[in-house]
């Protein structure tokens, strides 16, 4: 079984978070701002 240090906010530390993509220029043609995924 996992000890407590394997968990943060009740989730396994290795779980990637998925931010919503940000499009600063709104309705103009663009790509999303890149955000690093946390581990």
């Amino acid at each position: 079984s996992y000890s407590m240090e394997h968990f943060r906010w009740g989730k396994p530390v290795g779980k990637k978070r998925r931010p919503v993509k940000v499009y600063p220029n709104g309705a103009e043609d663009e790509s999303a701002e890149a955000f690093p995924l946390e581990f």
Partner: antibody, heavy 115, light 110 residues
Framework: QQQLVESGGGLVQPGGSLRLSCAAS?????????ICWVRQAPGKGLEWIGC????????YYASSAKGRFTISRDNSKNTLYLQMNSLRAEDTAVYYC???????WGQGTLVTVSS | DIQMTQSPSTLSASVGDRVTITCQAS??????LAWYQQKPGKAPKLLIY???KLTSGVPSRFSGSGSGTEFTLTISSLQPDDFATYYC????????????FGGGTKVEIK
Amino acid sequence: QQQLVESGGGLVQPGGSLRLSCAASGFTVSSGYDICWVRQAPGKGLEWIGCIDTGSGNTYYASSAKGRFTISRDNSKNTLYLQMNSLRAEDTAVYYCAKGISSLWGQGTLVTVSS
Amino acid sequence: DIQMTQSPSTLSASVGDRVTITCQASQTISSDLAWYQQKPGKAPKLLIYAASKLTSGVPSRFSGSGSGTEFTLTISSLQPDDFATYYCQTYYDISDDGATFGGGTKVEIK
């Protein structure tokens, strides 16, 4: 110029279902964007419903939306959908689709749940 | 689930006033916070993303600050066009219900 246009709102009885559409223009949704649904009850604040990654088709929902609401896409029509089931009076709201975190939002479509 | 607590809910101010709105997250959200302005009958407009980055075309009197759990939107000198409702939103993690809005702050004329 990119644009999102919602449709499909209207009056529905409690327990009924409704499918809202969000037609995208000026960009190709299959390229892989986050398109999200947000609602606003009359005189109330904004509530996030969920998002779809239009590239992968992966969907993400608020806890309150899981089970009753389903987000999908039709790349051939460049359109996103919000399927709403088992509707209740408290689902009465203006429903918006939006491109991720941006100023690109639709004009909203009003859903009224009432008998 | 991430909760966003926004205060105050209503703010009465005059043209030229410095206005501050705060948003508190129930857990750390790094700098993944946006601020929106909404006027009656209209869709929200993105003002600030990444806690402090101004969207193109937004006047420099708007500024955002903070990271972790405490965030602030400041209007340095309130203009007539600024009377509206403002919302914060986190976008930290949509796979874990992490795109929640704050309850909103209505900025009204004193």
